[in-house]
Interface confidence: low
């Protein structure tokens, strides 16, 4: 029997050594953090231009406003990732023109169109989780195999409480309209 390497759980997307889950439901920013934690992941922290380009493409293709793990909640105007790392100066070029504008306490960052926007953290939006891909043993080839018939279970200790993450998500991504100031 051919042994395949499955670097990511069912319905997660593999990119450059990491697995990404693009939600099909919406939560506020804080609940999005919890959602990712419950599946052993983190609300996405972007580490490279390639990763940003990949994620922006996923978001813009689906025309969805999507939370990332970036906020200035700790100190107004100082943007920080949920892992505690600061926003690199080069990453500031990803803000949409005129953003971040902090109109009405907009302290959390989202993918919006072809760039980033700051918005109110209590708004429900889609979100992206990120975790390291499983490494394959040497006699296995690391590549994206056909998806397994059933979802991989959540990691041990993850709580497994987020049924919406592991539900079969066959519905078409719908257009999500939202106005920014």
């Amino acid at each position: 029997t051919e042994r395949l390497c499955h670097p990511c759980p069912w319905e997660w997307t593999f990119f450059q050594g990491n697995c990404y889950f693009m939600s099909n439901s919406q939560r506020n920013w804080h609940d999005s953090i919890t959602a990712c934690k419950e599946v052993g992941a983190q609300l996405v922290v972007i580490k490279s231009a390639e990763e940003q380009n990949f994620l922006q493409l996923q978001s813009s293709r689906s025309n969805r406003f999507t939370w990332m793990g970036l906020s200035d909640l700790n100190q107004e105007g100082t943007w920080q990732w949920v892992d505690g790392s600061p926003l690199l100066p080069s990453f500031k070029q990803y803000w949409n023109r005129g953003e971040p504008n902090n109109v009405g306490e907009e302290d959390c960052a989202e993918f919006s169109g072809n760039g980033w926007n700051d918005d109110k953290c209590n708004l429900a939006k889609f979100w992206i989780c990120k975790k390291s891909a499983a490494s394959c043993s040497r006699d296995e080839e690391q590549f994206l195999s056909p998806a397994p018939a059933t979802p991989n279970p959540p990691p041990a200790g993850s709580g497994g409480g987020l049924n919406d993450i592991f539900e079969a998500q066959k519905i078409e991504w719908h257009e999500h309209h939202h106005h920014h100031h």
Epitope: S48, L88, P89, S90, Q93, R97, G98
Partner: antibody
Framework: QVTLRESGPALVKPTQTLTLTCTFS??????????VSWIRQPPGKALEWLAL???????YYSTSLKTRLTISKDTSKNQVVLTMTNMDPVDTATYYC??????????????WGRGTLVTVSS | DIQMTQSPSTLSASVGDRVTITCRAS??????LAWYQQKPGKAPKLLIY???SLESGVPSRFSGSGSGTEFTLTISSLQPDDFATYYC????????FGQGTKVEIK
């Protein structure tokens, strides 16, 4: 028309503090995405980035020189000031200020001042 | 810090030649790379940004390519005004310049 002009002393003694001013026109440092940098070039050598200040007052410094550098801005005067402490003869260079434009194509330097030559000597 | 290495350091060429300068980054910088031209006693002038986008007013004989860690600046047909020193610069993480490539008359 967009212009940048550097000004400051042509001669500095070792251990002294250098203060350089970049006065610009044709753009505003309060416009989102715009920043001003200082870059230097020793005679016959390559360009070296020193410091950058953003429209939102974020400041960034060269790792190797950050303990000696301070960058600040006066938006109302359209000026950016760089101070460099404990000057040494190896700091002899032409000092340039340059603009980073607003937009989504990255944080390169699209416009430069003419530069000012600073000599460090006793 | 990201290091940028240009090659060659000096390039001897004649008018009409096709000239290629290479720039390598010590780690991936996606396409966050700019090229500048500098003439003696003058400030650098932006030629290319985002690895391959031509700055407004720059002649079309200049072109840039590459992504990740390897980049090239090409001058399709060298003109008398092109003899200068060329620098690459990354802006993926802070800002770093290459050591420069001097294009001189053969």
């Amino acid at each position: 028309q967009v212009t940048l002009r550097e000004s400051g002393p042509a001669l500095v003694k070792p251990t002294q503090t250098l203060t350089l001013t970049c006065t610009f026109s044709g753009f505003s440092l309060s416009t989102s995405g715009v920043s001003v940098s200082w870059i230097r070039q020793p005679p016959g050598k390559a360009l070296e980035w020193l410091a950058l200040i953003d429209w939102d007052d974020d400041k960034y410094y060269s790792t190797s020189l950050k303990t000696r550098l301070t960058i600040s801005k006066d938006t109302s005067k359209n000026q950016v000031v760089l101070t460099m402490t404990n000057m040494d003869p190896v700091d002899t260079a032409t000092y340039y200020c340059a603009r980073t434009p607003s937009g989504s194509y990255g944080r390169y330097f699209d416009l430069w001042g003419r530069g000012t030559l600073v000599t460090v000597s006793s | 810090d990201i290091q940028m290495t240009q090659s060659p350091s000096t390039l001897s060429a004649s008018v009409g030649d096709r000239v290629t300068i290479t720039c390598r980054a010590s780690q991936s910088i996606s396409n966050w790379l700019a090229w500048y031209q500098q003439k003696p006693g003058k400030a650098p002038k932006l030629l290319i940004y985002k690895a391959s986008s031509l700055e407004s007013g720059v002649p079309s004989r200049f072109s840039g390519s590459g992504s990740g860690t390897e980049f090239t600046l090409t001058i399709s047909s060298l003109q008398p005004d092109d003899f200068a020193t060329y620098y690459c610069q990354q802006y993926n993480s802070y800002w770093t310049f290459g050591q420069g490539t001097k294009v001189e008359i053969k």
